[in-house]
Interface confidence: low
Amino acid sequence: KLTIESTPFNVAEGKEVLLLVHNLPQHLFGYSWYKGERVDGNRQIIGYVIGTQQATPGPAYSGREIIYPNASLLIQNIIQNDTGFYTLHVIKSDLVNEEATGQFRVYPELPKPSISSNNSKPVEDKDAVAFTCEPETQDATYLWWVNNQSLPVSPRLQLSNGNRTLTLFNVTRNDTASYKCETQNPVSARRSDSVILNVLYGPDAPTISPLNTSYRSGENLNLSCHAASNPPAQYSWFVNGTFQQSTQELFIPNITVNNSGSYTCQAHNSDTGLNRTTVTTITVYAEPPKPFITSNNSNPVEDEDAVALTCEPEIQNTTYLWWVNNQSLPVSPRLQLSNDNRTLTLLSVTRNDVGPYECGIQNELSVDHSDPVILNVLYGPDDPTISPSYTYYRPGVNLSLSCHAASNPPAQYSWLIDGNIQQHTQELFISNITEKNSGLYTCQANNSASGHSRTTVKTITVSAELPKPSISSNNSKPVEDKDAVAFTCEPEAQNTTYLWWVNGQSLPVSPRLQLSNGNRTLTLFNVTRNDARAYVCGIQNSVSANRSDPVTLDVLYGPDTPIISPPDSSYLSGANLNLSCHSASNPSPQYSWRINGIPQQHTQVLFIAKITPNNNGTYACFVSNLATGRNNSIVKSITVSASGTSPGLSA
């Protein structure tokens, strides 16, 4: 069937269109094109005779049409009037006619649109804005874009006038955005430049910063005010209702108590005509004087004197605070505070009470500290210490002894030998000693301030022969897997070698055994029951040697898990039940029995004559070592059968 296809169907003004013929019959005489939907000689555009290849323009020919041998018609420089139907009349060789109609539409190329607005400065929550997309164009579709996105759905947004007008009701500051409109028709689409909506808003309630409302006398007051507003707000400050200045910041240097009061910031928007205010109350506190400490006794004597420290000056309705060693006061019966906390009394001072002490006065903003005060506590002398600790010396060596006693003020020292004053020095030196230098060496320490004296006596033996040593222990009854034991070989002697034996053998290598103090001390870590052996120490020098008597270590252990014997668990009725419980333990444990959870006797052996099936149940033996504080237990089930019913054993 003869058909006409318009390519394109929608044509832009000034462009061209081809009316393409499909299914053209064979054996044609010619054809003719007409404007409209029917053959009308008055509206003939062009005719074409195939035999002569002659094209003849008709009344509707515009000079823009070209006919092709295949009957297609090209129309150039399309104008709006060209819109409509076109009919092809085909005359076949047998003079039978055929017709086909096609059509196309002509649309203008759209100009770039622009946006007009009825209100360039709308006020938030009050005004509406109508944007209109210009120009008005027939057969065009209008679209809107906000921030390059399609229009959001909102009851405040309304499209009208064929979508050409976009109205924003009750604008808000959030409507400040980029708006574009777009015009579309079948042949073109054009987008406008952006229009930025400038919404006037505010001022919102201003905020005053910083937020703090308390200041000290002498500080600077610097307040800043801000309110969201378009255009930016104009600011005014009022103090206690009186206008101060028209600035965003209020600065008052070196404030006093008189600057306390209500501070108001007013924000004004000249375009919206609105004012908003915020009030803050500022309190300025007077600066208190720096406190200081007085003492009723600057040189107290340890364990004798009390000291009263007072925080000055006295101020009514003030909180006083105290610190010792940069920490708040410890709880102690020797520390007493007066009712107003202003006086701190130290009862019976000790050398540890030196301080430093600080007091503080608390005001509304902060705490003012005094300078620290240190007490000069007089103490001592303590018992003097004579070093070195050797008591045995060989003839011919030099004897050099030093004495020290804790004391404030420092002690004065004197040396006596066998009760006779030797010298008033802290050190005693005797060269090239002999057996005659053996004796009692006394150091006397004296505190001139307290008048107290203390002495220490040391026995010095000068001999070529070493004495028989002895073993001292720091723990005579250590607990297994818990305690350590340190054996020390006495005495301490100069230029002496110390040796150890265990059960007559030299020391085994063990990570639990450690020698220290020049081998004079043997430490056993985490003792076990196997460490309960005989320990001997020996001393030797170039001229003699000696061994101590043995010391046996008594290790407390257990109780281990007990064993109940005999092992039988099945008995015949009428037999005697004789159970014995044993647990390894040092010292021996205490035993107790429970049958079916019920306490029985506190013995090692449980005896029940002529048992019956009623004696069935659980038999528990409990062991307890009072020395180690440890307990243990074991449970055994006993079954008693009636005579002849079970192959059980009898006791």
């Epitope: 579709t141 906000v146 399609s150 959001p152 759905v153 808000t172 955005a177």
Partner: antibody, heavy 121, light 107 residues
Framework: EVQLRQSGPELVRPGASMKISCKAS????????MTWVKQSHGKILEWIGL????????VYNQKFKGKATLTVDKSSSTAYMELLSLTSEDSAIYYC??????????????WGQGTLVTVSA | DIQMTQSPASLSASVGETVTITCGAS??????LNWYQRKQGKSPQVLIY???NLADGTSSRFSGSGSGRQYSLKINSLHPDDVATYYC?????????FGGGTKLEIK
């Protein structure tokens, strides 16, 4: 009552393409944008893109350009998402969601029940 | 793209307790943030839009707050029915990115 009814679960071969439908009822179809969201790995949600039924305009997440094609049929109030050249990475639940807005904040007020897509040989 | 970071990834709380979920954006999103709840096997539903506004049908036990880059969702007086995964979402600019989700369980 607003409803978004999605097409049923799909099992598709790798390399194939498929189309999910989302039929809207109970509101004016052209009044809201239609958004598509992918839920994978149990909980991760990814925004694929949106289409404005009023004029057919689309906005895609760059990650899904070439993977998803969004279309609408206004006459049947139905939105479609075509997924192209599927791989196992595309196995997920896909939701359509109708947008609402206040000022310039959009949110997804109405959601379809989800369509499970499994890509497997 | 704007990145949304949610924390914690999961949390467990007792009935009656108050819980808070936070969400950070990689840039200022000016309050353009929504919160969604997704229960097991169900579609997500909006709880809060525009950072602070309660969506229709959302219980008043839920509240949203925040501005700039930091936002939070607070659930008062926890109910067993609140067990779900919660998501925040940027809606300032496309792509409308979601947070990684917070799975809420009842102790």
């Amino acid at each position: 009552e607003v409803q978004l009814r999605q097409s049923g679960p799909e099992l598709v071969r790798p390399g194939a393409s498929m189309k999910i439908s989302c039929k809207a009822s109970g509101y004016s179809f052209t009044a809201y944008t239609m958004t598509w969201v992918k839920q994978s790995h149990g909980k991760i949600l990814e925004w694929i893109g949106l289409i404005a039924p009023y004029h057919g305009g689309t906005v895609y997440n760059q990650k899904f350009k070439g993977k998803a094609t969004l279309t609408v049929d206004k006459s049947s109030s139905t939105a479609y998402m075509e997924l192209l050249s599927l791989t196992s990475e595309d196995s997920a639940i896909y939701y359509c969601a109708g947008g609402a807005s206040s000022g310039f904040v959009t949110w997804f007020a109405y959601w379809g029940q989800g369509t499970l897509v499994t890509v497997s040989a | 793209d704007i990145q949304m970071t949610q924390s914690p990834a999961s949390l467990s709380a007792s009935v009656g307790e108050t819980v808070t979920i936070t969400c950070g954006a990689s840039e200022n999103i000016y309050g353009a943030l929504n919160w969604y709840q997704r229960k097991q096997g169900k579609s997500p539903q909006v709880l809060i839009y525009g950072a602070t506004n309660l969506a229709d049908g959302t219980s008043s036990r839920f509240s949203g707050s925040g501005s700039g880059r930091q936002y939070s969702l607070k659930i008062n007086s926890l109910h067993p029915d609140d067990v779900a995964t919660y998501y925040c979402q940027n809606v300032l600019s496309t792509p409308y990115t979601f947070g990684g989700g917070t799975k809420l369980e009842i102790k």
